[in-house]
């Protein structure tokens, strides 16, 4: 034979070719990509598993058949050589023998050769048939294994991608949880700080309550003494009146009474010639009821009625509805003039409102509203403002449209919480809104990060508590 070739065909099957004389025998064996022999190194992310026993068996049998084939091929080669040798010898004999015997001998030899060749061909055909059957079975089995492996690999890939997705989701959730934990810790710290502040406030309030209780006891004692003194005085006055009526019965009883000049606001006081800063007595519109107010007769042309002042934290602004209605504090220091008076006054004519602010760094600013009035008590002294100008922010720190007034005992804000209790002080709270000039007073360097301080958001931000504030009103036509 000429050669023995082992190669790969185009569809990935292993090809065995045996060339024997003019005859060529070709065996095609399947070799799938995912089925590797143990000798070939192959790394895969697929799950490793044992090869099916049946498959190993078939491979072994195929190897045996290959060996048989090779032996047969060897045997045929030997046979061919033997025939050629014999033919040479016989050819010599034939040449030596008589010419007449030559044709008969030739025919006999040819017949022998043909018989032997036919026998070998039959054997080879049987072997080929066996090999083809075996390879077909192997092809089917390998195909099944390949399909099963592909299916498994697909499942594994699906599971891997699912695991990756879950891992991504898990890491995302872990980050989220960590972020929430951080946020939670910050919130807890903030709550703890607020709690500490509240505890400090509560303990302070307790001591104030104790002091007040003592004062009440003293006041009660003083009151009973005063009542006795008053009673005695009344008796003396009655006696004097009796004496006077008896001794001066001939005289004219009419007494000339000095006419009392009353002022509605500081603008009227200013126009009457009083141009000095100070405390003046004002009269409620259409009433004889009086109220003391501080008049600023110098700033911006004078005539300003001060309706609120904060400067040193000496007055507690966490007051009741009634206290904010009638006013409290000291007009020469920290005070609130009173919602009822301001409401009545600002509904008589048009007023402007000026809010003057000071921070702890020596800066000053103001907000001026060209029209200001308060609704009546029935409408919770709602604030109405128009036309903002000034240096304390381009946006109004008093929420627009105006809100109702709220106090610790009169919750009229837009929050489910109680802004007045939480932020302290009475104010026109929204929910809770960007300002509160009646908040807790905090001194220098302790005035930042204070949620319940004296706030004017659009000038100093939310956590900054101001040093001083003044709210003042004046007629628009002054």
């Amino acid at each position: 034979y000429n050669n023995f070739r082992k190669s790969m065909d185009s569809i990935g099957k292993k090809q065995y070719q045996v060339q024997h004389g003019s005859c060529s025998y070709t065996f095609l064996l399947p070799e799938m990509d995912n089925c590797r022999s143990s000798s070939s190194p192959y790394v895969s992310n697929a799950v490793q598993r044992d090869a099916p026993l049946e498959y190993d068996d078939s491979v072994q049998r195929l190897q045996v058949l290959e060996n048989i084939m090779e032996n047969n091929t060897q045997w045929l080669m030997k046979l061919e050589n033997y025939i050629q040798d014999n033919m040479k010898k016989e050819m010599v004999e034939i040449q030596q023998n008589a010419v007449q015997n030559q044709t008969a001998v030739m025919i006999e030899i040819g017949t022998n050769l043909l018989n032997q060749t036919a026998e070998q061909t039959r054997k080879l055909t049987d072997v080929e048939a066996q090999v083809l059957n075996q390879t077909t079975r192997l092809e089917l089995q390998l195909l099944e294994h390949s399909l099963s492996t592909n299916k498994l690999e697909k499942q594994i890939l699906d599971q891997t991608s699912e695991i990756n997705k879950l891992q991504d989701k898990n890491s995302f959730l872990e980050k989220k949880v960590l972020a929430m934990e951080d946020k939670h810790i910050i919130q807890l710290q903030s709550i703890k700080e607020e709690k500490d502040q509240l505890q400090v406030l509560v303990s302070k309030q307790n001591s104030i309550i104790e002091e007040l209780e003592k004062k009440i006891v003293t006041a009660t004692v003083n009151n009973s003494v005063l009542q006795k003194q008053q009673h005695d005085l009344m008796e003396t006055v009655n006696n004097l009146l009796t004496m006077m009526s008896t001794s001066n019965s001939a005289k004219d009883p009419t007494v000339a009474k000095e006419e009392q000049i009353s002022f509605r606001d500081c603008a009227e006081v200013f126009k009457s010639g009083h141009t000095t800063n100070g405390i003046y007595t004002l009269t409620f519109p259409n009433s004889t009821e009086e109220i003391k107010a501080y008049c600023d007769m110098e700033a911006g042309g004078g005539g300003w009625t001060i309706i609120q002042r904060r400067e040193d934290g000496s007055v507690d602004f966490q007051r009741t509805w009634k206290e904010y209605k009638v006013g409290f504090g000291n007009p020469s220091g920290e005070y609130w003039l009173g919602n009822e008076f301001v409401s009545q006054l600002t509904n008589q004519q048009r007023y402007v409102l000026k809010i003057h602010l000071k921070d702890w760094e020596g800066n000053e600013a103001y907000s001026l509203y060209e029209h200001f009035y308060l609704s009546s008590e029935e409408l919770n002294y709602r604030i109405h403002l128009k036309g903002l100008t000034g240096t304390a922010g381009k946006i109004s720190s008093i929420s627009q449209p105006g809100n109702d007034f709220s106090t610790k005992d009169g919750d009229n804000d837009k929050c489910i919480c109680k802004c007045s209790q939480m932020l302290t002080g009475g104010w026109w709270f929204d929910a809770c809104g960007p300002s509160n000039l009646n908040g807790m007073y905090y001194p220098q360097r302790q005035n930042t990060n204070k949620f319940n301080g004296i706030k004017w958001y659009y000038w100093k931000g939310s956590g900054y508590s101001l040093k001083a504030t003044t709210m003042m009103i004046r007629p628009a036509d002054f």
Epitope: E193, D196, Q197, V200, L201, S203, K204, S207, I208, D312, G313, S314, V315, D316, F317, Q318, T424, M440, Y441, Y442, P443, Q444, R445, Q446, N449, K450
Partner: antibody, heavy 119, light 111 residues
Amino acid sequence: EVQLVESGGGLVQPGGSLRLSCAASGFDFSRHWMSWVRQAPGKGLEWLGEINPESTTINYAPSLKGRFTISRDNAKNSLYLQMNSLRAEDTAVYYCARPGDDFIYFDSWGQGTLVTVSS
Amino acid sequence: DIQLTQSPSFLSASVGDRVTITCRASKRVSTSGHSYMHWYQQKPGKAPKLLIFLASNLESGVPSRFSGSGSGTEFTLTISSLQPEDFATYYCQHSWELPWTFGQGTKVEIK
């Protein structure tokens, strides 16, 4: 645990200069105001000045008349006091102190470093 | 500057005694919410230690025999039952406005 450790003290001649350091640990130094306080031998406590976390605000006691400078390096967790034109009356133990978060009481102090101004 | 005056400057007492130290400010250092006065204890060779903050709040880890009170301009530190480890110098400090100042100190000695 909050720890403040002063260093840099020693003997210096009148008119001389000295730079004190305060190494902070156990808290987020970059979030806190810091102060310097001194105590002359047998005398009371005297607050010298303070610096805010960003070094944008520094407040001094009026008595120092610009001779002392407070600075800080947040990356090194360190506070500094540069003292110039030193006088005999500057002899004292110098403390760095941390005020509380919300109110100015000093809840953490260093052990102090002694500065002696003498010829 | 706000001046703080402590009285007495020296105080001799025995273990178990009730001791009261006063601190007067030259200006009001209280609001309706807080009193900005704080108390410290200092032992020889040591740094001061915070006892009371905002007039009446006990610093954590400080024994309950220490208490503070007062508002406005007058404040007191009270030790209900003096212990051997309480013999030291006590200082008040305000935080109403810059500069922060300390009292001159009250030295509590063993009688």
